[in-house]
């Protein structure tokens, strides 16, 4: 089944602002889960990033990363996520379906969830941003 | 054992600004929760009045009323929150306490602490 | 953003099953924490998280809910529950804020 455009695409100066502002967000994210002592990355999750089979800007996986950051808000109620999830919003360009992800049970193994999703999140912003900017370069060449 | 010691309370006259202090103690301060301001007029309910996080991000929550009047600040170094409250008036008489809040699943109920509260009387 | 608690007050005997309830304005996502107080004394956390045993509470205090409603149930009222309960909801998330539940005394029927 096709999905319908809910949005007009972003000119791409207007996503790289959005995304540079998510590499922001998602490196103070990072900071602060990184503050809880103990806890390890686990191999169990993966957040999707980008696309191969896609041009930027249109290769950010958002509706799915938007999934898993959501995930992450049932856990925790730090503001940065609130404003993280926002910012993601103005990158889904058309209706996706609902990315289900299951929430670990295990207090300790949410820890793990929150941390692993938070620095494969500011990675992926990392790349996004170079997949951007490399973008921008092979047009203007 | 980690404690939140308020002080700065007394009386002040209608009009007067007065800065409540929270120090916390046996623990610092940390990304993973809230410490907020919650105060009780004598034989009345809870309520609440500003929360600033502990984190990269100081975000501050206020209670509609508290906007304007009431300022809520931090200092790590001294591990203590503010409350700064002007234009006092006979219906901010209360106990203030100083309340520590989980920001999610981190360390589960031991995120909840309250202090003993300090008494705020306006009156002329 | 509005926290409903009801009722304002019951009375009750020992040994009776209490259910107070708290009605939130909007979905707060189980960010829902209920608390004894007694005169004199700050708020003591009895339910976080909706329905999590808080540490050293007895285990006839318990919470369920989700969404915007939440209830709190004391299975068999001892003579130490004699107090004010409160539910709270401590979400830092910029749509919803924080509150308190307007109190449900709970005192000795007769």
């Known amino acids: 089944s096709h999905t319908l455009p809910v949005r007009l695409l972003r000119p791409s100066d207007d996503v790289q602002k959005i995304v540079e502002e998510l590499q922001s967000l998602s490196k103070m994210l990072l900071k602060d889960v990184e503050e809880e002592k103990g806890v390890l990355v686990s191999q169990n999750y993966t957040l999707p990033c980008l696309s191969p089979d896609a041009q930027p800007p249109n290769n950010i996986h958002s509706p799915a990363i938007r999934a898993y950051l959501k995930t992450i808000r049932q856990l925790d109620n730090k503001s940065v996520i609130d404003e993280i999830i926002e910012h993601l919003d103005k990158l889904i360009f058309q209706d996706a379906p609902e990315t289900n992800i299951s929430v670990p049970t295990d207090t300790h193994e949410c820890k793990r969830f929150i941390l692993t999703i938070s620095q494969q999140f500011s990675e992926c912003m990392d790349l996004a941003l170079k997949s951007l900017t490399s973008g921008a370069q092979q047009a203007t060449t | 054992q980690s404690q939140l010691v308020e002080s700065g309370g007394g009386l002040v006259q209608p009009g007067g600004s007065l800065r409540l202090s929270c120090a916390a103690s046996?623990?610092?301060?940390?990304?993973?929760?809230?410490i907020c301001w919650v105060r009780q007029a004598p034989g009345k309910g809870l309520e609440w009045i500003v929360c600033i996080s502990i984190g990269s991000r100081a975000d501050t929550y206020y209670a509609p009323w508290a906007k304007g009047r009431f300022t809520i600040s931090k200092d790590n170094s001294k591990n203590t929150v503010y409350l700064q409250m002007n234009s006092l008036r006979a219906e901010d008489t209360a106990v203030y306490f100083c309340?520590?809040?989980?920001?999610?699943?981190?360390?589960?109920?031991?995120?909840?602490?309250w202090g003993q509260g300090t008494l705020v009387t306006v009156s002329s | 953003f509005q926290l409903t608690q009801s009722p304002s007050s019951l009375s009750a005997s020992v040994g009776d099953r209490v259910t107070i309830t708290c009605q939130a304005s909007q979905s707060i996502d189980s960010w829902l924490a209920w608390y004894q107080q007694k005169p004199g004394k700050p708020p003591k956390l009895l339910i976080y998280q909706a329905s999590k045993l808080a540490s050293g509470v007895p285990s006839r205090f318990s919470g369920s809910g989700s969404g915007t409603d939440y209830t709190l149930t004391i299975s068999s009222l001892q003579p130490e529950d004699f107090a004010t309960y409160y539910c709270?909801?401590?979400?830092?998330?910029?749509?919803?804020?924080w509150g308190f539940g307007t109190g449900t005394k709970v005192t000795v029927l007769g």
């Open positions: 309340a520590r809040f989980s920001s999610g699943i981190y360390d589960l109920d031991r995120f909840f602490l």
């Open positions: 709270q909801t401590y979400y830092g998330g910029g749509h919803i804020g």
């Open positions: 046996g623990f610092s301060f940390s990304a993973n929760y809230w």
